[in-house]
Every structure is written in structure tokens, then in C-alpha cells.
Interface confidence: low
């Protein structure tokens, strides 16, 4: 079978796979006058054998952990042993099968943790290595936990990266841990070969005990600072600490104050910076931030609150600068002419803001002094001796001392003796008869004005006159205001009409006085007025229950999930058909009929979030009126994005030969929603054979450095493949190349003939 | 002291079905995973199935859709439920709690003929 197992001398690759005893030969090398025999060099390991007529064969089993390719030459000799073709190259690459058991690094691994870290951010690494080769599943690794000890409720408090062997905590780790419960717990960790997959994977197992320490970054208890403060500023009131040195404090106000009298320096000290003012603002809450040198925050913040204390810095003050009040003649001793209401700027319901209050003077003293006394507390004035008669003194004038625990101020009180109230206000019609409107006529529309006349003395509460709806109207839809001049009525619309649900009122008016009537005088039939209000009918479009509507789901969430729903009703009771507008992206539907909104699309946050949509109300039937309402998603984001190069790094070099080891740093990003902390990747080399010549080591987050190990490198590219793990809820991983050229340089860049190649890196390192 | 008691096995023909079970005492049975090997005569010891603490399941190909492993951690008890059996599934069926360092039982037989 010429071609497959014989054939002339030319370069040849052969595939072998190891631990096998040799089964049959490699090649038969066919022999071209004046050639007659074959000798063999190279990488033998006296296990490759030619024989003289050119019989390629191996004597015993290949090791690929000893060598993964053997690199032979092949030389034609003729009758004298002089080579007359070749050698040519014969390489034989020896594949890989699992014959090699993973093995941890340690049979034990020792490390901490703090109670309440970042759920997934790892705090330990275990370690195996396999022989067998890592491009294949024989020597892919994984990592599992098989026991937590102790275990409490059967809740696991940590994970591993199966792939990284990263340990890190659960949300319930997060959350649970107490190093005051217990502070120390027993991870056993197996590794397998073949990717865990397989039955006849290899494995290992290793022991992690764990310490949890105290986590210091607590909020501190809320703080209570007098207002007014006459110590020398800065004044401390609170601190915060990170669990280790080194951290930057930093103080963010999310109110964003005018005035931020508030400081944080390095030690995580917090100080007042000036006088408060309880009056100006009682309580501040702002956040304590840790961050590391890179301005990375190291944890959530910290909410601080500061409460300020009152102190009695505020006088009492008058509601205005006189008060006027009436009284009428013949009124009898107790009753009350009015209430005086002071106020006081400082603390509610404390003893700096409780009032007192005496009258001081009382002008003039006609017939005697002492007429009107007042509660003390409550500020009530009661007539307190006798009537009082107009003619006598028409009016009194009061001085009032109001006081707190330290203050006292005057207020100035003006009494009006008045006519006895014995008429009673007289409308001019008890019937005003029937009024028709549409229902759409505007709010604030006077429809009506109606008139009542009282012969009591004119300008005084007992000649006033205040209409009231007192009957039909049980909506308010309607109001009447007066003209003090006049006592005319104006009936004014306060509230949209509705022929759907008062189509016909029959409205009943009441006018009354402010002032009491004396005793023996009601109001009677004259005192009341009724009119009839129709209301016509107006097609209205139907009215959605919200302006805007809005749902949040995930954005994973499967086709078909019912997303939200909208409600609209139309007045005159027709049937509604619900459509949607503007659904640029096609991710939704709509059920006509009631108003549920389907997703029919695979949703994505990272394209938008919140998606909105228009959401249409039509009329079935009449004359298809309709109105629109909005509708926001909001997509709650799910780790879906691997990470990535968060910018292009073609073009990085270093000048060869290198004088000393160097490194780059790159970043990396991801499209995931990243809260107030940002993004914590991990980063490691993406493939065991790149750990010869390479080292990538975390800078913080989002940075890492990509360092060379030794100095030997060849000039040419090399393509260094990052693993780049986002630690999420699942983690994901992206593998990223960074293409590294070793070139001559001229003065700092890479130098490269006229027209040997294009895409010159410009980057050096 | 740990002990674990195998029970269910017994002579079955091709095709039929066998419930084993396996009670532990001694240990904190929920903090365990839990697996089933098989040895038959001259064969190595194989992994029939695995669960682990957090759920996860692995099974021997040879047996995948045929053979399901459950847990009941009140009971302290991990279940084999194996259908369709077939000739070359007899075997002595160990149980195991804490993977190959673990806890082993004495086993229980499993014959499948006709």
C-alpha cells in the first residue's frame, strides 16, 4: 500500500499515542539508486529504530511526559555510507492519555476570611497539577468542594471555582458568618481529571481550614450633636475603620448639600467642621467610603447619621403684627372670642418650644380691667367679667406676653365689639333653577352666582355671609366663593363633572354667618336655595389607571413570561382593545383583551434598561376613541457577558534582546451591571504551557500586569492567552489574547526592513 | 462509631428494577456527599453513581438514564433506584459517604439473569 506506510524519503509527522506497546511499524522508506541503506539520528531515546532497508519502527512504549515530541532526521546512504539524500525531518508528536493522577500542591492549605466579604471574591487558591496535557481533557482540572465542616441547616457558606480553584463565599457565607459562632471551619477539596466528567477520571483530594476574622467595617451608631456648638471646629463625633491599613476615606453626601459641614480624614475619623442648625436641618445621613490606592471602594459604604439636638435658641413669634378678632355685644361671660397661635421655631412637643401665654395690658380699661382672660397654654380668649356694649367702647386693644423656657415676646391682640348677630342671611331666590353643561366644561368655570342679603352691621361676622353646598354634591365637584363687599356667590366647578355618575344634581345652598346667632335665632327656610345641575354627555376616550405603568423582571427570563399588565376603563362602559407603539426592539405583545404584555424575545439589559414601550387604549366600537399611557421595563441584569479587553492592545512590544524582565498592564471590562463597587475579575493564564515564559499577577478589579519571567525570548509575535473570570452568579469566563512582539528597535520602537510585514506594532514596552 | 447498612439487593431478571439503600449512623450525614461503587468478580471497583452536598449528580456512562441516586437527610439514608437492568450490572454494590478517603459499607449483592 504504497503512500500510507512506505513511500520515498520526504519530511514526514507521524502521531503516536503514548503507554502503547508497539503494534506495527511507523514507515517503510523506499530506497532510490544509488541510496541502499538508512541511518536514523536525532532524538531516538533509543526507542526509534530504522532498519538498514528502511523499516521505521519504535522498540517500546512513548512517555509524552518525558517527551512530548521526538525530533528524528532520516538520511539515504549509499553502498559507501555516504549520505546521497536527506536527512529530512521525520517529527513524531506523542498524543497524550490520561496516565497521570492530579495532585495538589499541598495536602493541606491554610487561609482567612472575613465575615461579610463580597460574596464570589475569592480568598484562596488551591492548586493541582496533572502531568497529562492541559489542551486535552486528560489534563483539564476540577476543583469540588465534598465537605463543609461544620455544616449548619445544611447551608453552604463556600464555593469553588471548579475550573480555578478559587474559594470564595456564598451569599449565605456572606451574610452568615460569625467569627463570634464559630471561627473556624474544614473545607475537603477534590480534583479531578478529564474535566469531572468521566467515570475514569483521576482525583485528588486536599484539606482547607479556614479562619473567619471579624469584620471591623461596621456602621458606627447613629450620633446626636447639640446644635449651635461654641467648641473649636473640627470637632470629632465618629469613626469608621477598614480591616487593614492603607485604605483612603472618603465621605460621599447623597443629598448634596449646599453646605456639607462634615470631614473624614485617614484614619477613618469623622468630624463636624461647623456649627449645626437644627432649624436649618435636623438630621443628615451620608456614607463612609473605603477605598483602595487604585480608588477601587474595598466594600459597600457605610451609612452615617447624624442627628442634631435642639437647643432653646428660637423666641417665641406672633402670627402677625396685630390680630384682629370680634365679639358681640351681649355675648355671655365664657365665651370664646378667639385663639391666639403663636409659634416657635425651635424643637416640637419639647420645653423649648412650649408656649405660655398672658395678657399684660388691656386698653382701655372700660368699663374696668380684667374683661378677657386667656388659657395659658392653649391661647384661647374668653370673655371673663361681663358683656359688652358698643357704644361704651367699640374697641379693646390687648398686649399679650408670650414666653418659652427663656424667651418672652409681645404680640398685639385687637378686639371689635359688634353688633349682635339676630338677623339671619335671606336668599333673594330659594330656586335657581335648572342649569344644563356638558360634562367636559373646564374646571373653574363660574356656572351660577347666587345672593343672600343680612341686615346685621355691615363688615362684621355677623353680616358676613359663607355659602355651602350642603346637599347633591357629595363629589365636591362644585364650590361657591363669596365677594366680601357684596355677599355674592359664585358657584364655580372645582372637579371635572361626569355624566357617567351624576348626570342630574339637585343642589341644596346653605348661607350662614361666621359669627353665632344670639340665642333664640335659627336659621330657617330663607336661609336655603336649591338648584338642579344636567350634565350632558361627551364621548371620552378611555382612561388608563396609571400615566405610567411600570414591571421589572430578569433579563433571562423565558419567551412567553408575562412581563406586566395595564388597565384602562372607558367612561361610557364600551369594551377596550389594548395595543402597543414603539416597540423598536419586537421584545414584546400584548393581549388585546386584557392587557397583558408578553415577552416574544430574548430580553437584554445591556441594550437598554428600562425598555419603553407606548401602551394604546382603543374604544370597540362608538367612535373609536383612544388615549395613551406608558410602560417602562426595567431588566434586572443577569451575569451573561463574559469579560473582555476593554480596549484594543494590537501593536504591544518589547525591544530584543531583553535586558531584564518587563511587563504591561492591560484592563479588562464586561457589559454587566456593576453596583456601587465595580467589577472584581480574576485574572490567570489561559493555557499551563504559557507559565514557562509568563505571569499575569491582579492589580485591583478590573487591572492586571503581564509580566515575563525570564529574558530568552525569540524575535518574533507571541499570542499570550488570559483567562479573564468575572467571579458572577454563574461565573463566566473569557479567554483573551494579547499579541506581544519581540523586535529590534531604533531608538525606542520596532524597526522593521522596507515591506517585510504590515501591522508594525507601535506600543513598547 | 460510623456504620453503613446496605440493603435492597437480590436476584432480579434482565430488565427488571431494584431499590438499595443505605442507612449511615455515627457521622453528620448532610455534610457528606454520597456514592454507590460496584465491584464485580475479577473487575476493578467502579463509581456507579455520585451526590454530592449541593445536589450535583454524576453517574457512570454505562448506567446513565437507567440508575438514579437520592438522598433523604432526615433519614440519614442514600437511595440507588436501578431500572432496566441488565446482565453485566451484577455485581456487589457498596455504598460510600466522604468520595475514595470516605466511609465504605459491607455491600449487598446484585444478580441479574434470566
Known amino acids: 500500500q504504497e503512500g500510507k506506510f512506505s513511500g520515498p524519503l520526504k519530511p514526514m509527522t507521524f502521531s503516536i499515542y503514548e503507554g502503547q506497546e508497539p503494534s506495527q511499524i511507523i514507515f517503510q522508506f523506499k530506497a532510490n539508486p544509488p541510496a541502499v541503506t538508512f541511518e536514523l539520528t536525532g532524538e531516538t531515546d533509543n526507542i526509534f529504530v530504522i532498519e538498514r532497508e528502511g523499516l521505521l519502527y519504535y522498540n517500546r512504549a512513548l512517555d509524552r511526559e518525558t517527551r512530548s515530541t521526538h525530533n528524528l532526521q532520516v538520511a539515504a546512504l549509499d553502498a559507501n555510507g555516504i549520505i546521497v539524500e536527506g536527512p529530512v525531518p521525520i517529527t513524531i508528536k506523542v498524543k497524550d492519555i490520561n496516565d497521570n493522577r492530579p495532585t495538589f500542591l499541598q495536602s493541606k492549605y491554610e487561609g482567612s476570611v472575613r465575615q461579610n466579604s463580597r460574596p464570589g471574591k475569592p480568598f484562596l487558591y488551591v492548586n493541582a497539577t496533572d502531568l497529562d496535557d492541559p489542551a486535552t481533557p486528560n489534563g483539564q482540572l476540577y476543583y469540588q468542594i465534598v465537605i463543609q465542616l461544620p455544616m449548619i441547616n445544611n447551608v453552604m457558606y463556600f464555593q469553588i471555582n471548579n475550573k480555578t480553584g478559587a474559594i470564595s463565599l456564598t451569599r449565605e457565607g456572606s451574610q452568615e458568618l460569625n467569627p463570634a459562632k464559630n471561627p473556624s471551619y474544614n473545607l475537603v477539596i477534590s480534583v479531578k481529571d478529564m474535566g469531572g466528567q468521566s467515570e475514569n477520571s483521576f482525583s485528588d483530594t486536599t484539606s482547607v481550614d479556614i479562619i473567619v476574622t471579624e469584620n471591623i467595617w461596621k456602621a458606627p451608631k447613629p450620633v446626636e450633636m447639640v446644635e449651635n456648638s461654641t467648641d473649636p471646629h473640627p470637632i470629632k463625633i465618629t469613626q469608621v475603620r477598614w480591616n487593614d491599613p492603607g485604605a483612603q476615606y472618603s465621605l460621599v453626601d447623597k443629598e448634596k448639600l449646599p453646605r456639607f459641614p462634615f470631614s473624614i480624614d485617614q484614619e477613618g475619623d469623622i468630624y463636624v467642621t461647623q456649627p449645626l442648625d437644627r432649624e436649618e436641618k435636623d438630621a443628615y445621613v451620608f456614607y463612609a467610603v473605603a477605598k483602595d490606592e487604585y480608588g477601587k471602594p474595598l466594600s459597600y459604604p457605610l451609612e452615617i447619621h447624624v442627628k442634631v439636638k435642639d437647643i432653646n435658641d428660637n423666641p417665641p413669634t406672633c402670627p402677625s403684627p396685630v390680630t384682629v378678632f370680634e365679639v358681640q355685644e351681649n355675648e355671655r361671660l365664657g365665651n370664646s372670642i378667639g385663639t391666639l397661635t403663636a409659634h416657635d421655631r425651635d424643637e416640637e412637643n419639647t420645653a423649648n418650644s412650649f408656649l405660655n401665654y398672658r395678657i399684660v395690658e388691656q386698653t382701655p380699661k372700660l368699663p374696668m380691667d380684667g374683661l378677657f382672660l386667656i388659657q395659658t397654654y392653649a391661647g384661647m380668649l374668653q370673655l371673663a367679667k361681663q358683656s359688652l356694649k358698643k357704644q361704651d367702647t367699640p374697641q379693646y386693644n390687648l398686649t399679650i406676653e408670650v414666653s418659652d423656657k427663656d424667651f418672652k415676646t409681645l404680640c398685639f391682640v385687637q378686639i371689635n365689639v359688634i353688633d349682635i348677630n339676630d338677623q339671619i342671611p335671606i336668599f333673594e331666590k330659594s330656586d335657581y333653577g335648572n342649569l344644563t353643561l356638558a360634562e367636559d366644561t373646564n374646571i373653574g368655570s363660574t356656572i351660577l352666582t347666587i345672593q343672600a342679603t343680612d341686615a346685621d352691621e355691615p363688615f362684621t361676622g355677623s353680616s358676613k355671609i359663607l355659602y355651602h353646598i350642603i346637599k347633591g354634591d357629595s363629589e365636591g365637584r362644585l364650590g361657591v366663593d363669596t365677594d366680601p363687599h357684596t355677599n355674592t356667590g359664585y358657584v364655580i366647578i372645582k372637579k371635572p363633572l361626569d355624566f357617567e355618575t351624576a348626570a342630574v344634581s339637585n343642589i341644596v345652598f346653605k348661607a350662614e354667618n361666621p359669627e353665632p346667632l344670639v340665642f333664640g335665632v335659627k336659621y330657617n327656610a330663607s336661609s336655603f336655595a336649591k338648584f338642579t345641575l344636567i350634565v350632558t354627555d361627551v364621548n371620552e376616550a378611555p382612561q388608563f389607571s396609571q400615566h405610567v405603568f411600570q414591571a421589572k423582571v430578569s433579563e433571562d427570563v423565558a419567551i412567553g413570561t408575562k412581563v406586566g399588565n395595564v388597565t384602562a376603563k372607558d367612561p361610557e362602559g364600551l369594551d377596550i382593545s389594548y395595543s402597543l407603539r414603539g416597540d423598536t426592539r419586537g421584545w414584546l405583545k400584548i393581549d388585546h383583551v386584557t392587557g397583558e404584555i408578553f415577552s416574544v424575545a430574548p430580553l437584554d439589559r445591556e441594550a437598554g434598561s428600562p425598555y419603553r414601550v407606548q401602551v394604546v387604549a382603543t374604544e370597540v366600537g362608538g367612535s373609536s376613541l383612544s388615549s395613551v399611557s406608558e410602560f417602562h421595563l426595567i431588566l434586572m441584569d443577569v451575569n451573561d457577558n463574559p469579560p473582555r479587553l476593554a480596549k484594543d492592545y494590537t501593536g504591544l512590544f518589547f525591544c530584543h534582546p531583553l535586558s531584564a524582565p518587563g511587563s504591561l498592564i492591560f484592563e479588562a471590562t464586561d457589559d454587566d451591571q456593576h453596583l456601587f463597587r465595580g467589577p472584581h475579575f480574576t485574572f490567570s493564564l489561559g493555557s499551563g504551557s504559557l507559565q514557562n515564559d509568563w505571569e499575569v499577577s491582579k492589580i485591583n478589579g478590573t487591572h492586571a500586569r503581564l509580566s515575563t519571567r525570564h529574558t530568552e525570548f525569540e524575535e518574533r509575535e507571541y499570542v499570550v492567552l488570559i483567562r479573564i473570570n468575572d467571579g458572577g452568579r454563574p461565573p463566566l469566563e473569557g479567554i483573551v489574547s494579547l499579541p506581544v512582539t519581540f523586535c529590534s528597535c531604533v531608538e525606542g520602537s520596532c524597526f522593521r526592513p522596507a515591506g517585510h510585514q504590515t501591522g508594525i506594532p507601535t506600543v513598547g514596552m | 462509631e460510623v456504620q453503613l447498612v446496605e440493603s435492597g439487593g437480590g436476584l432480579v431478571q434482565p430488565g427488571g428494577s431494584l431499590r438499595l439503600s443505605c442507612a449511615a449512623s455515627?457521622?453528620?450525614?448532610?455534610?457528606?456527599?454520597v456514592g454507590w461503587y460496584r465491584q464485580a468478580p475479577g473487575k476493578q471497583r467502579e463509581l456507579v453513581a455520585q451526590?454530592?452536598?449541593?445536589?450535583?449528580?454524576t453517574y457512570a456512562d454505562s448506567v446513565k438514564g437507567r440508575f438514579t441516586i437520592s438522598r433523604d437527610n432526615a433519614k440519614a439514608t442514600v437511595y440507588l433506584q436501578m431500572n432496566s437492568l441488565r446482565p453485566e450490572d451484577t455485581a456487589v454494590y457498596y455504598c460510600?459517604?466522604?468520595?475514595?478517603?470516605?466511609?465504605r459499607g459491607q455491600g449487598t449483592q446484585v444478580t441479574v439473569s434470566s
Open positions: 451526590l454530592t452536598i449541593n445536589g450535583d449528580t
Open positions: 455515627g457521622l453528620r450525614f448532610s455534610s457528606y456527599a
Open positions: 460510600n459517604l466522604g468520595g475514595s478517603k470516605g466511609y
